[in-house]
């Protein structure tokens, strides 16, 4: 999906109002310095591409993030403010269903959500030069 035509300001507002709080809740008890940010993005569409990938695509050691509250609200925001987004997700969801077993918070998931927090922070500061 090409995120170029999304309403970035509305997605940002939803992130600041609620998604960010759900990410913090997920990470509660984890030190903010515990994980190094290794995933980056260069502009808002690129950030949303990376956010979608980390949130909804199962990875080795963390197959369960798509069932978390922040993921549900992220999906809602993208579907509402990115034209045509919900129509592109059918195949992705089928793959997700096969990969998902149970909701277990592993250290790998905590690391992945830490990366997500970094991507969202970058999304909110689009004018900053890439480090």
């Amino acid at each position: 999906y090409d995120f170029t035509n999304c309403d970035f300001e509305k997605i940002k507002a939803a992130y600041l109002s609620t998604i960010s709080k759900d990410l913090i809740t997920y990470m509660s008890g984890t030190k903010s310095t515990e994980f190094n940010n290794t995933v980056s993005c260069s502009n808002r569409p690129h950030c949303l591409t990376e956010i979608q990938s980390l949130t909804f695509n199962p990875t080795a050691g963390c197959a369960s993030l798509a069932k978390e509250m922040f993921a549900m609200k992220t999906k809602a925001a993208l579907a509402i403010w990115c034209p045509g987004y919900s129509e592109t997700q059918i195949n992705a969801t089928q793959a997700m269903k096969k990969a998902r077993k149970s909701k277990v918070t592993t250290n790998k998931c905590l690391e992945q959500v830490s990366q997500l927090q970094g991507l969202w922070r970058r999304f909110n500061r689009p004018l900053l030069k890439q480090q």
Partner: antibody, heavy 121, light 108 residues
Framework: QVQLQQSGAELVRPGSSVKISCKAS????????MNWVKQRPGQGLEWIGQ????????NYNGKFKGKATLTADKSSSTAYMQLSSLTSEDSAVYFC??????????????WGQGTSVTVSS | EIVLTQSPALMAASPGEKVTITCSVS???????LHWYQQKSETSPKPWIY???TLASGVPVRFSGSGSGTSYSLTISSMEAEDAATYYC?????????FGAGTKLELK
């Protein structure tokens, strides 16, 4: 304007199944989570689960897994909930409610009028 | 599962009286995830207060909401007849979504 129109009251036999519907209009049906909520007579509200019509993803309250099955038909903008192996405990009013951002806060912002299900022999 | 405990379960207030309904949450949640709904008999619930303190469209300004962490409240500054209803708090912080048992507010 957003509207959620639910199917009519049902009187069903114990052990049978029932499928109730919620027809949405006034918004992009595929892009919003649809929730289902149970209310027994004189009791409070209980969340059953939700479905994302765009791809059929569901989240259930563990208490209702095996009891409720949520589906959605994008072509008719209608969400469905099937209740199986009905007992008197399933006699209740069932509401559909859209999940949406209001002032960028996420909540159930529009509700159907409710469908009464009575289980009786 | 997050448990929401409302108090009182039932109360009666005279016109003009100040009313406060509380919602205690079993584990701390963000204020953005605590909502209130109003339900009158035989009708569907209506969104009443979003994210602890934002009034839904059409809700009179005599209503207000506050709180954080595990303690939230809905306040009516001056009770009116049309405020008689059942009020439910609800959390959208973690699955399963849960509601308080409700507070039935009657007119004295």
């Amino acid at each position: 304007q957003v509207q959620l129109q639910q199917s009519g009251a049902e009187l069903v036999r114990p052990g049978s199944s029932v499928k109730i519907s919620c027809k949405a209009s006034g918004y992009a049906f595929s892009s919003y989570w649809m929730n289902w909520v149970k209310q027994r007579p004189g009791q409070g509200l209980e969340w059953i689960g939700q479905i994302f019509p765009g791809d059929g993803e569901t989240n259930y309250n563990g208490k209702f897994k095996g009891k409720a099955t949520l589906t959605a038909d994008k072509s008719s903008s209608t969400a469905y909930m099937q209740l199986s192996s009905l007992t008197s405990e399933d006699s209740a009013v069932y509401f559909c409610a859209r999940g949406g951002y209001v002032n960028f806060l996420y909540a159930m912002d529009y509700w159907g009028q409710g469908t009464s299900v009575t289980v009786s022999s | 599962e997050i448990v929401l405990t409302q108090s009182p379960a039932l109360m009666a207030a005279s016109p003009g009286e100040k009313v406060t309904i509380t919602c205690s949450v079993s584990s701390s949640i963000s204020s953005s995830n605590l909502h209130w709904y109003q339900q009158k008999s035989e009708t569907s619930p209506k969104p009443w207060i979003y994210g602890t303190s934002t009034l839904a469209s059409g809700v009179p300004v005599r209503f207000s909401g506050s709180g954080s962490g595990t303690s939230y409240s809905l306040t009516i500054s001056s009770m009116e007849a049309e405020d008689a209803a059942t009020y439910y708090c609800q959390q959208w912080s973690s699955y399963p979504l849960t509601f308080g048992a409700g507070t039935k507010l009657e007119l004295k």
